[in-house]
Interface confidence: medium
Amino acid sequence: TQHGIRLPLRSGLGGAPLGLRLPRETDEEPEEPGRRGSFVEMVDNLRGKSGQGYYVEMTVGSPPQTLNILVDTGSSNFAVGAAPHPFLHRYYQRQLSSTYRDLRKGVYVPYTQGKWEGELGTDLVSIPHGPNVTVRANIAAITESDKFFINGSNWEGILGLAYAEIARPDDSLEPFFDSLVKQTHVPNLFSLQLCGAGFPLNQSEVLASVGGSMIIGGIDHSLYTGSLWYTPIRREWYYEVIIVRVEINGQDLKMDCKEYNYDKSIVDSGTTNLRLPKKVFEAAVKSIKAASSTEKFPDGFWLGEQLVCWQAGTTPWNIFPVISLYLMGEVTNQSFRITILPQQYLRPVEDVATSQDDCYKFAISQSSTGTVMGAVIMEGFYVVFDRARKRIGFAVSACHVHDEFRTAAVEGPFVTLDMEDCGYNIPQTDESTLMT
């Protein structure tokens, strides 16, 4: 996963028009694993911002060493800084932990840009603002890294919450969440509410502000409005889902739906942007440009290289379109859509020239590894990673940034046929080609 800016075809849309709604089978929400309702001790346990990642406080070792850990649903290793580094205020000191066990094995993780490497071991781990449990978990002690830690981000490690299949060095290294579920009575589910500020935060504001919530083992109903809609997890490696249709301001992009998932579509809290396959990105930008044509923006803006600034408080949100992603539903031939606002896909950044301006970066970018629904998507929604039932739920987040005219939305059901054909089957090779 990259933090910062990363970390035979058929349409599948034949048949009934998408606007035709299917009757709900029931008005009751499906039964959820875990406690329902309130998880007061876990609400507001995240800090950070989309550009640098959201982190949770964890303790490692005996006596406990407190570290801030990036929450990353796009990887599967629990890895922490374990040696001095210019960007780290603190790091895991294995020699000070009486419960540390060395696995006598190294791990090397290259990213598209940058890398980290370290030594594997196990130790006791807990989450102070999480379930009241301690688990023995695998830990990669990062001894060397390049372009991994972010100056000023305030996190010292990464909590990979995806599945064992993409763990490094191989799938035999049990991820943290698997260990947690195995060793405790915590239900096999977690949910994330990432709260974008809607304006740039300086270092002290990030430290003082609430960034959101990671509810471990359940769903907190105070964190969302409306209903939760679930999409199947296609395969348990990344949190892979299937997008069946894309609309810009209600206008269908009209692409073969396989293109939307080429070569996969994942939900990744460790990536800043909404990342789209090349063809889809080009079509989406063309459509967004057309919708916002009352202003002409530089090419550099659409490439994410250039800021656009407005005088404070005058951002013309109304000229930018909403973006809807239709996701495969749980019922045959049924989909639902999630809709984000420009308040999600225009990311506020500090303008180094003046504080009189509100400056933004376009936070949709091109990908060569499929669609990545990163923080800019997740900031609109409460997202439930229901591992027990192999599905991901979306509801409108109680903390999403919007204006008086438009709000993010999760709506359904819609009739969509042949959705299975929207998934891309990655050719299997003997050697892993994974480049997170």
Epitope: E295, K296, F297, P298, D299, G300, F301, E305, Q306, L307, V308, C309, W310, Q311, T314, P316, V349, D351, V352, A353, T354, D357, C359, K361
Partner: nanobody, 128 residues
């Protein structure tokens, strides 16, 4: 609607000076980043001096560094280009430009494709 109107062009002997002005109107609710481009006969339009950097620094083409100075008067919505020690190769139509965005990474937004609005241009002719 945003409009840019240049003035101050004309003919001058090599070594002489000219001051171009560009008045911007219609910027109702936001600020733009201003600059000057030029286009000589048979050549592509090129950036001369742009204030498109978020840091407020001005980019100058190598060929005009030390001779041309761009300044901006925000109160009057006017941008100026003071051109000294003019050379025959400075002969061109000079265009005022406004960009919607600024470059945050320190590199200049100095390509005509990045410009949101153009003036109609003013002719500068330098004879030897």
């Amino acid at each position: 609607d945003v409009q840019l109107q240049e003035s101050g062009g004309g003919s001058v002997q090599a070594g002489g000076s000219l001051r171009l002005s560009c008045v911007a109107s219609g910027f109702t609710y936001r600020r733009y980043f201003m600059g000057w481009f030029r286009q000589a006969p048979g050549k592509e339009r090129e950036a001369v001096a742009t204030m498109f950097s978020c840091g407020g620094t001005t980019y100058y083409a190598d060929s005009v560094k030390g001779r041309f100075t761009a300044t901006q008067d925000n109160a009057k919505n006017t941008v100026y280009l003071q051109m000294n020690n003019l050379k025959p190769e400075d002969t061109a139509i000079y265009y005022c430009a406004a960009a919607s965005g600024c470059w945050y990474d320190g590199s200049p937004a100095a390509r005509s494709v990045d410009v949101s609005f153009w003036g109609h241009g003013t002719q500068v002719t330098v004879s030897s």
